[in-house]
C-alpha cells in the first residue's frame, strides 16, 4: 500500500496501525489519506512538533499503551478534522497548555490511565465540541473551578480512579448536556449541596468506592433524568428522608457496602422505574412495613449480609413485580406468615445463613412461581406439612446444613424429598442431626423406624408427590460449601467494576451462577 511505513500496516479503508516495541518515534511517511491511525504498544516516549502534519484528513488517532511521557504543544497541529483522540495508557504527568488547540472537530478525548497530576481550565478551553472526556486512572487531587466550563456539549465525563478528596460545587455547573458522570474510586468524603444541580440531563452518576459519609438532602433534586446511581462502598450511615425524592427515572440504585443501620420511611420513592436495589453489606437490623412500597417495578432486591433480625409483615408491600429477593446471611429467627404474601412474581428467594428455626406453613402461599429456594445453614428441624405443595415450578431447593430432627414427624418431608430429589442438587443433601443414632445419615434415605420406633405415621404423606420431570428448566447446580467465588457485583454497564472476594457458597446475592452471570 503506497506510502505505508514498514513498521505499520495500512488497509484500503484508510486505516493505519503501527505497533511494536521497536517503534521509538512516530513512523513516517504516513499515508496522506489516512483517516484512522493507531500507535499501540510502542516505545515512543515523546511527541514532537507536528508529527501528523501531512495527514490532515485524520478522524481518529489512538496513541495508547506506549511509554509516552512528554508532548510538545504543537503535536496535533493541522488535525482540524480529528474527532477521536486517545492518549490512554501512557505515562503523561503534565499536559501542555494549548495541546488541543485547533482540534475544532474533536468529540472524544481519552486521557485515562496516565499519571496526570492536574488539569487546568486552559487545557480544554478550545474543545467546544467535545462530547466525551475520559480522565479516569490518573493522579488528580482536585479539579479547579472552570476546568470544564467550555465543554457545554459534553455528554460523558469520567473522573474515576483518581485521588480527588473534594469537589467544588461549581465545577460541573455548565455541563447541562452531561449524561454520564463517573467519580468512582476517589477519596471524596462529602459532596457539597448544588454540585449536580446543573446536570439536568444526567442519566448515570457513579460515586461508588469513595469515602462519602453523608449525602446532602437535596443532592440529586435536579437530576430528574437519572437512571443509574451508584453509591456502593462508601461510608454512608444514614440517608436523608428526601434524598431520592426527585428521581422518577431511576432504574438501578446500588447502596451495598455502606454503614446503613436503618432505612428511613419513604426513602425510596416514588421511583416507579427502579428495577434493582442493592443493599447488601450494610448494618440494617430490621425492615418496617412499607419501606419499599413505592418501588412498584422493582425486580431485584438484595438485602443479604446485613444484621436483619426482624421483618415486619408488611415490609415487602408493593413489590408485586419482584423476581429476586436475597435475605441470606442475616440474623433472621422468625418470619411472619404474611411476610411474602405480596410477592406474587417472586422466582428466587435466598434465606440461607440465617437462624430460622421453623417456617410458617403458608410462608410461600401466594408465591406460586418460585423456582429456587435457598434454606441451607439455618436451624430448621422440620418443615410444615405441604409447604411446597403448590410450587410447581420449583427446580432448586437447598436444605442442607440444618439440624433436621429425624423422628416420625419428618416422614412427610422425607417422602416428598424422595420424590423430588433432583430439586435438592447433587452436591450436598440434607442429613439428620437428631436423634443421635442417625446423626449424619441422609434425610432422604433414613429409615425413620430405626430412629423412632412404633409411631403411627399417616399412610398418605401430606407433601405433594409431584413427580420430577427431567425437562423442567433447571439452574446449573454450582453450589459448593467450600467454593470461593470472584464476584463482580452488580454488573454495571462499564468496565470499572468493583470486585469483591467472597467465600460464600453462592455469591453475594445468593443466586445461582446462571443469574449472577
Amino acid at each position: 500500500y503506497h506510502g505505508c511505513p514498514s513498521e505499520c500496516t495500512c488497509s484500503r479503508a484508510s486505516q493505519v496501525e503501527c505497533t511494536g516495541a521497536r517503534i521509538v518515534a512516530v513512523p513516517t511517511p504516513l499515508p496522506w489519506n489516512a483517516m484512522s491511525l493507531q500507535i499501540l504498544n510502542t516505545h515512543i516516549t515523546e511527541l514532537n512538533e507536528s508529527p501528523f502534519l501531512n495527514i490532515s484528513a485524520l478522524i481518529a488517532l489512538r496513541i495508547e499503551k506506549n511509554e509516552l511521557s512528554r508532548i510538545t504543544p504543537g503535536a496535533f497541529r493541522n488535525l482540524g478534522s480529528l474527532r477521536y483522540l486517545s492518549l490512554a495508557n501512557n505515562k503523561l504527568q503534565v499536559l501542555p497548555i494549548g495541546l488541543f488547540q485547533g482540534l475544532d472537530s474533536l468529540e472524544s478525548l481519552l486521557l485515562s490511565s496516565n499519571q496526570l497530576l492536574q488539569i487546568q481550565p486552559a487545557h480544554f478551553s478550545q474543545c467546544s465540541n467535545l462530547k466525551e472526556l475520559q480522565l479516569h486512572g490518573n493522579h488528580l487531587e482536585y479539579i479547579p473551578d472552570g476546568a470544564f466550563d467550555h465543554l457545554v456539549g459534553l455528554t460523558k465525563l469520567n473522573l474515576g480512579k483518581n485521588s480527588l478528596t473534594h469537589i467544588s460545587p461549581r465545577v460541573f455547573q455548565h455541563l447541562g448536556n452531561l449524561q454520564v458522570l463517573r467519580l468512582y474510586e476517589n477519596r471524596l468524603t462529602d459532596i457539597p449541596m448544588g454540585t449536580f444541580d446543573g446536570l439536568v440531563n444526567l442519566q448515570e452518576l457513579a460515586l461508588q468506592q469513595n469515602q462519602i459519609g453523608l449525602l446532602s438532602p437535596g443532592l440529586f433534586h435536579n437530576n430528574h433524568n437519572l437512571q443509574r446511581l451508584y453509591l456502593s462502598n462508601n461510608h454512608i450511615s444514614q440517608l436523608p428522608p428526601s434524598v431520592f425524592m426527585q428521581l422518577p427515572q431511576l432504574n438501578r440504585l446500588t447502596l451495598f457496602g455502606n454503614s446503613l443501620k436503618e432505612l428511613s420511611p419513604g426513602i425510596f420513592g416514588p421511583m416507579p422505574n427502579l428495577r434493582e436495589l442493592w443493599l447488601y453489606d450494610n448494618h440494617i437490623s430490621s425492615l418496617p412495613d412499607n419501606v419499599f412500597s413505592n418501588l412498584r417495578q422493582l425486580q431485584v432486591l438484595i438485602l443479604s449480609r446485613n444484621q436483619i433480625s426482624f421483618i415486619s409483615p408488611g415490609a415487602f408491600n408493593g413489590l408485586t413485580e419482584l423476581r429476586e429477593l436475597s435475605l441470606h446471611t442475616n440474623a433472621l429467627q422468625d418470619l411472619d406468615g404474611n411476610v411474602f404474601r405480596m410477592l406474587a412474581n417472586l422466582q428466587n428467594i435466598s434465606l440461607q445463613n440465617n437462624r430460622l428455626r421453623q417456617l410458617p406453613g403458608n410462608i410461600f402461599a401466594n408465591v406460586n412461581g418460585l423456582m429456587a429456594i435457598q434454606l441451607q445453614n439455618n436451624q430448621l428441624e422440620n418443615l410444615p406439612l405441604g409447604i411446597f405443595d403448590h410450587l410447581g415450578k420449583l427446580c432448586e431447593l437447598r436444605l442442607y446444613d440444618n439440624p433436621w430432627r429425624c423422628d416420625s414427624d419428618i416422614l412427610p418431608l422425607r417422602n416428598w424429598l424422595l420424590l423430588n430429589q433432583p430439586r435438592l442438587g447433587t452436591d450436598t443433601v440434607p442429613v439428620c442431626f437428631s436423634p443421635a443414632n442417625v446423626r449424619g445419615q441422609s434425610l432422604i434415605i433414613i429409615n425413620v423406624n430405626v430412629a423412632v420406633p412404633s409411631v403411627h405415621v399417616p399412610e398418605v404423606p401430606s407433601y405433594p408427590e409431584t413427580p420430577w420431570y427431567p425437562d423442567t428448566p433447571s439452574y446449573p447446580d454450582t453450589t459448593s460449601v467450600s467454593s470461593t467465588t470472584e464476584l463482580t457485583s452488580p454488573v454495571e454497564d462499564y468496565t470499572d467494576l468493583t470486585t469483591i472476594q467472597v467465600t460464600d457458597d453462592r455469591s453475594v446475592w445468593g443466586m445461582t451462577q446462571a443469574q449472577s452471570g
Epitope: P265, D289, S312, G314, D334, D336, R341, P360
Partner: antibody
Framework: QVQLVQSGAEVKKPGASVKVSCKAS????????INWVRQAPGQGLEWMGW????????KYNEKFKGRVTMTRDTSTSTVYMELSSLRSEDTAVYYC???????????WGQGTLVTVSS | DIQMTQSPSSLSASVGDRVTITCKAS??????VAWYQQKPGKAPKLLIY???YRSSGVPSRFSGSGSGTDFTLTISSLQPEDFATYYC?????????FGGGTKVEIK
C-alpha cells in the same frame, strides 16, 4: 375466623405478679406474631411487646423490660403475659392482639382487667 | 420513642357532620400509621392502616390521609354508631406508640 380469647379479671396486691393468658384459634398459631397492649382506666393504649409463638422469641418495650415475660404453649395455642413487681399504675385492661398483613393490630382479644390494689 | 400527638382530645359533633382528627408524629414514620375506633368496655377496632387504606368491613365514610409526620382521619358524615374514641398508632419503629385519643361526643 381468627379469635383471641383472654383469661378473666384479676385483682393483685402491689409487688405481686399476674399472668394473663390468650388462647388463639382460627389460624396456625405458630405462624404469626402476637402482641400485648394495655390501657389504663380512662387512658390511651400502650404497646408492651410481642412474642413469636413458633420459636418463643420476644421483643419487649424498654419500659417493661425486666418486669414482663411473654411465653407460649404450642400444645394449647396459648400465649401468656406475666407482669411482675406490680404497682398501682399497672391497673389496666391488658389486650392480646395479632397483626394482619402489616404491623397494625387487626385482631384483638376481649381484654383482661388487672387491678392492683392494696 | 416516637410521640404521636393527637388533636383535638375531644370534640362534639352532630349526626351528618364532617369530622377531622389529626395526628402528628415526632419524627418521620412514612405511611406506617393506623387508626382505631374504641367504644367503652370494648377492644379497639382497626379502621385504617398504611395511613389511607380502609380495613375490611369499614364503611367508606372513614378515610385516612397523610405521610411523614402529619396524618388525618376523616369521617365524612358522622353516624350515631361513630360516637367513640379514636386512636392513631405508628408502627414504623419500636416501641410502637399510640396517640392520646380523640373522644367524639354527641353535641
Amino acid at each position: 375466623q381468627v379469635q383471641l380469647v383472654q383469661s378473666g379479671a384479676e385483682v393483685k396486691k402491689p409487688g405481686a405478679s399476674v399472668k394473663v393468658s390468650c388462647k388463639a384459634s382460627g389460624y396456625t398459631f405458630t405462624d404469626y406474631y402476637i402482641n400485648w397492649v394495655r390501657q389504663a382506666p380512662g387512658q390511651g393504649l400502650e404497646w408492651m411487646g410481642w412474642i413469636y409463638p413458633g420459636s418463643g422469641n420476644t421483643k419487649y418495650n424498654e419500659k417493661f423490660k425486666g418486669r414482663v415475660t411473654m411465653t407460649r404453649d404450642t400444645s394449647t395455642s396459648t400465649v401468656y403475659m406475666e407482669l411482675s413487681s406490680l404497682r398501682s399504675e399497672d391497673t389496666a385492661v391488658y389486650y392480646c392482639a395479632r397483626w394482619g398483613y402489616g404491623a397494625y393490630f387487626t385482631y384483638w382479644g376481649q381484654g383482661t382487667l388487672v387491678t392492683v390494689s392494696s | 420513642d416516637i410521640q404521636m400527638t393527637q388533636s383535638p382530645s375531644s370534640l362534639s359533633a352532630s349526626v351528618g357532620d364532617r369530622v377531622t382528627i389529626t395526628c402528628k408524629a415526632s419524627q418521620n414514620v412514612g405511611i406506617n400509621v393506623a387508626w382505631y375506633q374504641q367504644k367503652p368496655g370494648k377492644a379497639p377496632k382497626l379502621l385504617i392502616y398504611s395511613a389511607s387504606y380502609r380495613s375490611s368491613g369499614v364503611p367508606s365514610r372513614f378515610s385516612g390521609s397523610g405521610s411523614g409526620t402529619d396524618f388525618t382521619l376523616t369521617i365524612s358524615s358522622l353516624q350515631p354508631e361513630d360516637f367513640a374514641t379514636y386512636y392513631c398508632q405508628q408502627y414504623n419503629s419500636f416501641p410502637y406508640t399510640f396517640g392520646g385519643g380523640t373522644k367524639v361526643e354527641i353535641k
